[in-house]
């Protein structure tokens, strides 16, 4: 009989304790928010937000221009004196709450916890490849705004998500933000907001669309808006809130809103819950039926997903998919099942579901006693009636009324447990070749970069590695540059590079010629890698 | 009523620029986005760009950035649009337009009444 | 950018019926559509605003809907002065585009 060499198992053909040194940057302080910027001329920028400063990076991480955005009542503050001679508001540190890029025109908008959540436009300057700030613009005009009414006033100190969209000549800010008591009574910046940046760049247009928790419920009820996001005709915002007005507030649950983007109005704005569950294919007794749940979303993202992903979900390959990563509870602690799980919903499902669930409420017959919902936002009210009315009048439609959809999208955990005890604490989903990869940031500073399958009892990595030292973790905003990541942790930005940061953590020649297509790797000598770390024989058809 | 009222037709040689204008009238120029089109003989419409005449913030579509460039004179109400490098491609009726909003939507509700522009040698 | 394909790029009608021209966008832009009308050596005007609103001055026999993708415009119970060339555009994102025209000619 013809002696075999003895099979290598699976996870001693790599080494996740290899170290990888990626590019990064130190912010000088806790990276509060990150966006980037690609122009259409090779001209690209990181824009990185600490408390009181914001840094302009280059392609390269290095720096290129910092703009001091506080402490409020400083002189030295760059962002504030935009705004003329003060004082504006009471003094005290800037943490930034908003950070996005408005891409019609471009410019960069950030807007802090100070001076009533306004909001500050810099222009982009290209030059050459770098791109500066231009002096900034105060987007407050100081004889629009009063306490009650203030269309200026956009970030709440307990954190805001705003998507932009052009629409027309004007850019529109959908706004969502996280109320209580004290926030909603100084310069209430509203639970979710359409606002129209004007023209002149001196704020926002007055008489915006709005929806507020009631201040009935605003000491008990509060929502947390975790991602949000445009794709096709609408934008969308992810929420972790309690599932009940009336029941214990602790008892949470993750739902998505959507609005529309090509009207700039809340008529048609609907909600639907979001149900990940952590299924095991071999169900323990005294396991709940259906799964165990996983009710709260930590991170989230939305992609087009590669062929193979696409089959597994029955869906056409290069659809969108809402990606999210769910715990048990709001600490994310050790439950029965794995830490974290992974759920995808397609968004033409998601859509398909909210129109059905609007047809349920507004085409008779209507099933008697379902609620139109929503009531920490507007009166109580039975479908098809508007809110707080016992009827529909002639004029009115029951279409243009919020709506939360009376089921829920339930879908199982993708990886079926097998991040065990990872807590993930950043996501961003990409598509290589036809491969679906989940770039994962974990709560003790790891980077897990894994083929998004469902099929396998185990994990296919594309890399597991430490960002550094610190061992902080990696923050639930990712932005994308080029084809690298920019992952922050701590005071740290890290340059990732979407095909992983090489090849040396496959042990194996046969391991390492089994890598995607995508990661370059070939065997060197006596060690995987790239083509560009062997100055020797680098192979990539057979083994020695 | 409200008018726009462009320069004169223009012959122009291969490699030169032209900078053709546009007067407005009957209304304020700084409160409205300013807009110009290109037609080419028996041909479509296409958009060049924009310009606010409040704060000079220009938008261009991607095809036309390296051959406009926008301009206002406030104090003379005028809008001025110089196209550089200038080819036969370029020869064409070159309108502007304001643009307004209509409630939420914005259309293109004045037009001036064209410059012919034609390019040869 | 977002392509507006305009059909059909030429009609012919008689006075007194009706035509319709459709216009479609590549990708969603709500009711952000006007149409407009060229008379042979003058400047475009504008007609419908918003998908379906009628422009200040504009008889009432011209007319249009649709939202999204699918836009319609019509004329009905033609005259004469209408034997002209329409467009459509979109002003949902920049660039604007419009569509490539239509001629009306007479039968």
């Known amino acids: 009989e013809d002696w075999q060499c003895p099979r290598t198992p699976y996870a001693a053909s790599r080494d996740f304790d290899v170290k990888y040194v990626v590019p990064s940057f130190s912010a000088g302080g806790l990276v509060q928010a990150m966006v980037t910027y690609e122009g259409d001329r090779n001209e690209s920028a990181v824009f990185v937000a600490i408390r009181n400063r914001l840094h302009v990076l280059g392609p390269d991480l290095k720096s290129v221009q910092s703009l001091a955005t506080g402490p409020a009542g400083d002189p030295g503050c760059q962002t504030c004196a935009a705004c003329g001679p003060g004082p504006h508001g009471p003094p005290g540190d800037t943490d930034t709450k908003v950070l996005v890029l408005d891409p019609a025109l471009p410019a960069l908008v950030s807007c802090g916890s100070s001076l009533q959540g306004r909001c500050f436009l810099h222009d982009l300057e290209p030059q050459g490849t770098a791109v500066h700030l231009a002096a900034p613009a105060c987007l407050f005009s100081a004889h629009h705004n009063r306490p009650d009414d203030c269309p200026d006033c956009v970030a709440s100190p307990l954190g805001t998500r705003v998507t932009v969209v052009e629409q027309g000549q004007a850019s529109y800010f959908y706004v969502a933000s996280s109320l209580d008591a004290a926030v909603a009574a100084s310069f209430s910046p509203r639970s979710v907001s359409i606002r129209r940046l004007k023209a002149d760049a001196s704020g926002f247009a007055p008489g915006f669309v709005a929806l507020s928790v009631l201040p009935k419920h605003l000491v008990s009820y509060s929502i947390e808006y975790v991602h949000s996001f445009h794709t096709g005709a609408f934008v969308y915002f992810l929420t972790v809130q309690p599932a009940s007005v009336t029941d214990d507030p602790s008892a949470l649950h993750t739902r998505l809103a959507r609005l529309s983007a090509t009207e700039p109005e809340l008529g048609d704005y609907r909600e639907l819950v979001l149900d990940c569950r952590f299924a095991p294919k071999r169900r323990r007794r005294g396991a709940p039926e259906g799964g165990q749940p996983y009710p709260v979303l930590r991170v989230a993202h939305s992609a087009p997903v590669g062929a193979q992903l696409a089959t597994e979900l029955s869906i056409a390959e290069g659809q969108e998919v809402l990606f999210g990563v769910f715990v048990t509870g709001k600490d994310g602690g050790p439950g029965v099942g794995p830490n974290s799980v992974v759920c995808a919903f397609p968004i033409d499902l998601l859509d398909t579901l909210i129109d059905e669930g609007v047809e349920r409420c507004c085409e008779s017959p209507v099933h008697p006693g379902l609620r139109r919902g929503l009531d920490f936002f507007q009166s109580p009210s039975f479908c098809p009636n508007p809110p707080g009315l016992e009827a529909l009048s002639p004029n009115t439609s029951c279409r243009h009324f919020p709506l939360l959809v009376s089921s829920s999208f339930s879908r199982v955990d993708l990886f079926n447990g097998l991040l065990g005890p990872v807590q993930v604490t950043a996501l961003y989903v990409t598509r290589l070749d036809n491969v679906t990869v989940a770039h994962m940031g974990t709560m003790d500073g790891r980077i897990l970069q894994v083929e998004l399958v469902r099929s396998l009892n185990y994990l296919l990595y594309v890399s597991n590695f430490s960002l550094g030292d610190s061992g902080q973790p990696v923050q639930r905003d990712v932005s994308r540059l080029g084809d690298h990541l920019l992952f922050a942790s701590g005071d740290q930005v890290f340059q990732v590079p979407i095909q992983g940061p090489g090849c040396r953590h496959f042990l194996t020649c046969g391991r390492c010629l089994r890598a995607w297509h995508f990661m370059g790797c070939g065997w060197c000598g006596n060690m995987c890698g790239q083509q560009k770390e062997c100055p020797g024989s680098w192979q990539q058809d057979h083994c020695p | 009523q409200i008018q726009l009222q462009q320069s004169g037709p223009e012959l122009v040689k291969p490699g030169t620029s032209v900078k053709i204008s546009c007067k407005a009238s009957?209304?304020?120029?700084?409160?409205?986005?300013m807009n110009w089109v290109r037609q080419k003989p028996g041909q479509g419409l296409e958009w060049i760009g924009r310009?606010?005449?409040?704060?000079?913030?220009?938008r261009y579509n991607e095809k036309f950035r390296d051959k406009a460039i926008l301009t206002v004179d406030t104090s003379s109400s005028t809008a001025y649009m110089q196209l550089s490098s200038l080819t036969s491609e370029d020869t064409a009726v070159y309108f502007c337009?304001?643009?307004?909003?209509?409630?939420?939507?914005?259309?293109?509700?004045?037009w001036g009444q064209g410059t012919s522009v034609t390019v040869s040698s | 950018d977002i392509q507006m394909t305009q059909s059909p790029a030429s009609q012919s009608a008689s006075l007194g019926e009706s035509v319709t021209i459709t216009c479609l966008a590549s990708?969603?832009?709500?009711?952000?559509l006007a149409w407009y009308q060229q008379k042979p050596g003058k400047s475009p005007q504008l007609l419908i605003y918003?998908?379906?609103s009628l422009a200040d001055g504009v008889p009432s026999r011209f007319s249009a809907s649709g939202s999204g993708t699918k836009f319609s415009f019509k004329i009905d119970s033609l005259q004469s002065e209408d034997f002209v060339s329409y467009y459509c555009?979109?002003?949902?994102?920049?660039?604007?585009?419009f569509g490539g025209g239509t001629k009306l000619e007479i039968k």
């Open positions: 918003a998908a379906t």
């Open positions: 337009a304001r643009s307004a909003y209509y409630g939420n939507y914005v259309a293109m509700d004045y």
């Open positions: 009957d209304y304020t120029l700084t409160d409205f986005y």
């Open positions: 310009i606010y005449p409040g704060t000079d913030k220009t």
């Open positions: 990708q969603t832009i709500g009711t952000w």
């Open positions: 555009q979109q002003l949902y994102n920049t660039p604007w585009t």
